[in-house]
């Protein structure tokens, strides 16, 4: 259950939610390993080799979708698969990478002024002009496309990073996903371990900004592996 989240020292000692990032620019967000959040969904990164079983797209990361690994495979065995890039075949929007959508069975670019994301329902408490999703739990496989133009500002609820304005990414915070700032030089970031540990998290942090990567802080080299601090640094 999620109760362990409140018993975890890690949660009290996490850096501020806006203060961290992924160690690879290809991923929208970075997970704070070992932390559980309501919903129980897990987010995979390109550092992870272990396939993550899923029942629906929203259980996967922002750059993934949920499907059977083999064509015509057992429908009961589904895993998170890498999203499909532009001009690749698709059956639904969630299969296409952020910034694209599925049209006539092919992933095509989302013209910002024509198509933006998938929203199941217009939120009754709409956030100004942010027609944003709910709690990050919307079931993407059943969503209908809505047309809207405004990119989410900092603090807006979002589904994926393409819902957020420039300089922001879509990252989990507690029970929701909101637009948070991409990290600046010197800010704390999260470097994922390679061993496929598929950490549950309650906070996700954006990636490091352009020209920056998530690296171990020089004065922390002597520290134990578990307590090494990573920050966004110039390449």
């Amino acid at each position: 259950t999620l109760n362990s989240v409140l018993n975890s020292n890690a949660i009290k000692n996490l850096p501020p939610p806006l203060g961290g990032a992924a160690g690879h620019p290809g991923s929208a967000v970075s997970a704070a390993p070992g932390i559980l959040y309501p919903g129980g969904n897990k987010y995979q990164t390109i550092d992870n080799y272990q396939p993550y079983p899923c029942a629906e797209d929203e259980e996967c990361g922002t750059d993934e979708y949920c499907a059977s690994p083999t064509r015509g495979g057992d429908a009961g065995v589904q895993i998170c698969l890498a999203c499909r890039k532009r001009r690749k075949r698709c059956m639904r929007h969630a299969m296409c990478c952020p910034g694209n959508y599925c049209k006539n069975g092919i992933c095509v670019s989302s013209d910002q002024n024509h198509f933006r994301g998938e929203i199941e329902e217009t939120i009754t408490e709409s956030f100004g002009n942010d027609h944003s999703t709910l709690d990050g739990y919307s079931r993407r496989t059943t969503l209908s496309s809505k047309m809207y133009h405004t990119k989410g500002q900092e603090g807006s609820v979002c589904l994926r990073s393409s819902d957020c304005a420039s300089g922001l990414c879509c990252a989990r915070h507690f029970w929701s996903k909101i637009c948070k700032p991409v990290l600046k030089e010197g800010q704390v970031c999260t470097k994922h371990r390679r061993k496929g540990s598929h950490g549950l998290e309650i906070f996700q942090r954006c990636y490091c900004g352009e020209g920056l990567s998530c690296r171990i802080q020089k004065d922390h080299h002597q520290a134990s592996n578990s307590s090494r601090l990573h920050t966004c640094q110039r390449h």
Epitope: T1, L2, N3, V5, L6, I11, K12, L14, P16, P17, L18, G19, P38, G39, G40, E120, E121, I123, T124, E125, F127, L134, D135, Y137, S138, R139, E154, G155, S156, V157, H173, F174, W175, S176, I178, I202
Partner: antibody, heavy 117, light 107 residues
Framework: QVQLVQSGAEVKKPGASVKVSCKAS????????MHWVRQAPGQGLEWMGV????????SYNQKFKGRVTLTVDKSTSTAYMELRSLRSDDTAVYYC??????????WGQGTLVTVSS | DIQMTQSPSSLSASVGDRVTITCRAS??????LNWYQQKPGKAPKLLIY???RLHSGVPSRFSGSGSGTDFTFTISSLQPEDIATYYC?????????FGQGTKLEIK
């Protein structure tokens, strides 16, 4: 529109349990997490816990040390909060609250639970 | 848990006055601060989320500012219907915690 309708007031004896319900309408129940917050008479607000109706996952405030259990019935779009081993200082109005982001956007009308011998 | 301290605990002002309530967090909470209004016998209502974003349907006379540990809630021109208790809430770290409230009365 979104509505959260809670069960009526309860009077309980110390040591007893209470189960408060919160019936949701006007939205897809499984799409939003549901929180429970209580307010003792003349006091402030205190978060008790959260449940994800889509899978029943829960997270609780440690202060309640296993005395509280949150559940949902998806078929009736109803969330429940059970508090056990009631004490006089559990006398409070108990609210369910639905989130859209990390904030509580919609609230039930509240249920007064009085614990008295 | 993060402690939230509101001040003043009560205040009296006249219609048309500018009213300011402050909220201090025991540690840095970035922008993860919400403000709620509660009228007697009613459930709280969300006014402001993420420090300064106005919830839908909330009049523009309400505003929020600050960052880190010190935050301010302002009513630019007090109206009779604004009589209520106002609470700040941090959602930076679990469990979410609230300030003790500020009771606003009309002079």
């Amino acid at each position: 529109q979104v509505q959260l309708v809670q069960s009526g007031a309860e009077v309980k004896k110390p040591g007893a349990s209470v189960k408060v319900s919160c019936k949701a309408s006007g939205y897809t129940f499984t799409e939003y997490t549901m929180h429970w917050v209580r307010q003792a008479p003349g006091q402030g607000l205190e978060w008790m816990g959260v449940i994800d109706p889509s899978n029943g996952d829960t997270s609780y405030n440690q202060k309640f040390k296993g005395r509280v259990t949150l559940t949902v019935d998806k078929s009736t779009s109803t969330a429940y909060m059970e508090l056990r081993s009631l004490r006089s200082d559990d006398t409070a109005v108990y609210y369910c609250a639905r989130t859209t982001g990390p904030w509580f956007a919609s609230w039930g009308q509240g249920t007064l639970v009085t614990v008295s011998s | 848990d993060i402690q939230m301290t509101q001040s003043p605990s009560s205040l009296s002002a006249s219609v048309g006055d500018r009213v300011t309530i402050t909220c201090r967090a025991s540690q840095d909470i970035s922008n993860y601060l919400n403000w709620y209004q509660q009228k007697p016998g009613k459930a709280p209502k969300l006014l402001i989320y993420y420090k300064s974003r106005l919830h839908s349907g909330v009049p523009s006379r309400f505003s929020g500012s600050g960052s880190g540990t010190d935050f301010t809630f302002t009513i630019s021109s007090l109206q009779p219907e604004d009589i209520a208790t106002y609470y700040c809430q941090q959602v930076h770290t679990l469990p979410p915690t609230f300030g003790q409230g500020t009771k606003l009365e009309i002079k």
